[in-house]
């Protein structure tokens, strides 16, 4: 059997050591003890007696099935306790009585059915994070379960086999910053929602089949809900249940952000929100995020004209990796307040983009992200986007473009352009001179000779440049990142010729550790101020005797350098 390894500050690591019991020899000097991934099974009343100053105890996945009632009685300083993924089929309030300093408690993934016969947490007045429940057996939430808890930063409840929710069980917690609920179905959703309306600021619903969700008015008085964010992850919706969910928004008037992540819509987008009287109640929602939305019949999807009016005040929309191939012109025109639009990892091509960015489309748009779509012509893309009079930032990275032409047209206010990972080999005057930030990293560039008088930031890492670009090309450059190229050297003159340069990242290049380069680095201790990744990323590639040495440590041979 292996032993613990402890550092000078009292942090002890005993993970995956094949312990079959709590190891002996624990002391009051220990501040943190991690015994995860062992086969401990049992914690006796004296096993942790010596650890009076322990602040962190991690016992995750250690096959624990029995803990004596007073096993933790000496742990008054404990702030973090992780008992997740063990074999505890019942929980005891006597474990937690002495733990008055506890801030974090994870009991998730143990096979209990309830949280115990009596309230577990009345003494945990400092608790900030609580994780409870499991996938298969946790079936009941009762009013006594959260007694004594008044405020939590994070509460996560995995209740995927919930059979009974006692009304008002969650109401006793007056303030919850982030509540994550894993519910397999919507049976108790309305009851829970009513109980958390006045306490939760961010509600995250996971793995819930909402296909049969039906709204009914909540039994609540006029309530001013603090909820600002609502997220659905791994959930299933239908057109009908989406309409029903919208009706909940009348109770959360301060909601500013809605997110759907990895959800499935078994429908066609035939929404009818007008009858749910929510148009005005969406007034404060500014951010809508949709990622990996799976629509089995996406090829039959509607034009969403029924939700146009819902989204008129939204400022930020992300629809990522969801097979989007068109935003209809009329929809774009209705998105009057939209300032940020991210359509990454979709199926957009120039022909349909032209329809999406029609005259009057997205009139307030400042940032457009079209990364990893199916765009091919930089010239066409720029031309299509001329309708966007307020566009300042464009990300068309991870599209495979044809070679760029000599001239292109772009929206006149454009200041930021991301062309990273687009396979470009040469930069030409197609790139607008108005740019302040240009990202051309991860391409096939072996040179860069384009004059950009306003450029402040240049990202050109992961290319094939052999030297730093000429400073005269960028008279106001502040930041250059040129890591992972083939740069072999840089000199005092080169760096000095960038009059305003504040940050240079040039690590992981093929440095030839010549007398000149090494002399320069030795004589210039201020390099660390400008080279943000200095010294660890700056290694000699040659000569052979210095290969792999840091430039900072490499010493030129007196013989070589004074010939």
């Amino acid at each position: 059997q292996e032993s613990l390894s402890c550092d000078a500050s009292g942090v002890c690591d005993g993970r995956s050591r094949s312990f079959t019991s709590i190891p002996s020899g624990l002391t009051a000097a220990m501040k943190s003890l991690d015994l995860s991934f062992n086969k401990i099974t049992y914690i006796g009343h004296g096993d942790l007696r010596a650890c009076a100053n322990l602040q962190v105890l991690i016992l995750k996945s250690s096959r624990i099935n029995t803990i004596e009632g007073d096993a933790f009685y000496s742990l008054g300083s404990l702030e973090h306790l992780d008992l997740s993924d063990n074999h505890l089929s019942s929980l005891s309030s006597s474990w937690f009585g002495p733990l008055s300093s506890l801030k974090y408690l994870n009991l998730m993934g143990n096979p209990y059915q309830t949280l115990g016969v009596t309230s577990l947490f009345p003494n945990l007045t400092n608790l900030q994070t609580l994780r409870i429940g499991n996938v298969e057996t946790f079936s009941e939430i009762r009013r006594i379960d959260f007694a004594g808890l008044t405020s939590l930063n994070e509460l996560e409840i995995k209740a995927l086999s919930l059979r009974n929710y006692q009304s008002q069980s969650l109401k006793s917690i007056r303030d919850i910053h982030h509540l994550t609920l894993h519910l397999s179905e919507s049976a108790f959703l309305l009851e829970i929602f009513a109980d958390i309306l006045s306490s939760v600021r961010y509600l995250e619903l996971r793995d819930t089949n909402l296909a049969r969700f039906q709204f009914s008015p909540l039994p609540v008085d006029e309530v001013s809900s603090p909820m600002k964010k609502l997220a659905f992850r791994g959930s299933v919706l239908t057109d009908e249940s989406f309409n029903e969910l919208l009706k909940l928004l009348r109770y959360i008037l301060e909601l500013s952000e809605v997110e759907f992540d990895d959800c499935t819509l078994n429908g066609l987008g035939d929404f009818n929100p007008s009858e749910s009287d929510v148009v005005s109640e969406l007034g404060k929602v500014e951010t809508v995020t949709i990622r990996r939305l799976h629509i089995p019949q996406f090829y039959l999807f509607y034009d969403l004209s029924t939700v146009y009016s819902l989204l008129e005040k939204v400022k930020r929309i992300t629809v990522e990796n969801s097979k989007v191939f068109l935003v209809p012109c009329s929809f774009s025109q209705h998105l009057k307040s939209l300032e940020f639009l991210d359509l990454s990892e979709n199926l957009m091509v120039e022909e349909y983009l032209k329809n999406s960015a029609c005259k009057g489309a997205w009139p307030s748009l400042q940032t457009l992200v079209l990364s990893q779509n199916h765009l091919r012509s930089m010239q066409k893309t720029g031309e299509i986007l001329l309708t966007l009079k307020n566009l300042t930032s464009l990300d068309i990275s991870r599209n495979t473009f044809h070679p760029m032409p000599d001239s292109c047209q772009w929206p006149e206010k454009m200041r930021f352009l991301n062309l990273s990972s687009t396979g470009i080999r040469v930069v030409k005057t197609c790139i607008p001179q108005t740019l302040e930030v240009l990202d051309v990293s991860n391409n096939n560039l072996d040179s860069f000779s384009l004059f950009l008088p306003r450029l402040q930031e240049l990202y050109i890492s992961r290319n094939k440049l052999k030297t730093l670009p000429d400073a005269s090309l960028f008279p106001v450059l502040l930041v250059m990142k040129i890591r992972e190229n083939a740069v072999s050297t840089f000199s005092k003159d080169q760096l000095g010729s960038f009059p305003k340069l504040e940050t240079l990242e040039a690590g992981d290049n093929h440095f030839v550790c010549s007398c000149e380069l090494l002399s320069f680095t030795m004589e210039t201790p201020a390099l660390a101020q400008i080279l943000v990744d200095w010294p660890d990323s700056y290694l000699c590639d040659s000569p052979p005797r210095l290969h792999g040495h840091r430039l900072q440590d490499a010493r030129p041979s007196v013989l070589e350098c004074h010939q």
Epitope: L160, S184, H294
Partner: nanobody, 122 residues
Framework: EVQLVESGGGLVQAGGSLRLSCAAS????????MGWFRQAPGKEREFVAV????????DYSTYVKGRFTIFRDNAKNTVFLEMTSLEPEDTAVYYC???????????????WGQGTPVTVSS
Amino acid sequence: EVQLVESGGGLVQAGGSLRLSCAASGRTFSRYVMGWFRQAPGKEREFVAVINWSGGSTDYSTYVKGRFTIFRDNAKNTVFLEMTSLEPEDTAVYYCAAGEYYTGDSSRYDHWGQGTPVTVSS
């Protein structure tokens, strides 16, 4: 109506590995949550692992977490259970199940396979 057929069970030594497969018939496979359960002789059926419609969420019984991996291939209408570091206590008949709800509660699954036996010898 989805039909499920498990395969891949057999005899293996403690510490060894097995991969179970469950092939589903029908065109709506990707709409189902898929679960694996097991039943040892003389014991009740118990939850092993579950995967959601897209494969984006997975969960495991504490008894197998870290050793078993569930994954699915919707294009091939198949769900898999990769079992490593097998122990004699893992000996059981393993069943694949399909349902509408992401849960470890076996009563919520509507469709079941006939099972494939796994024996782990010490």
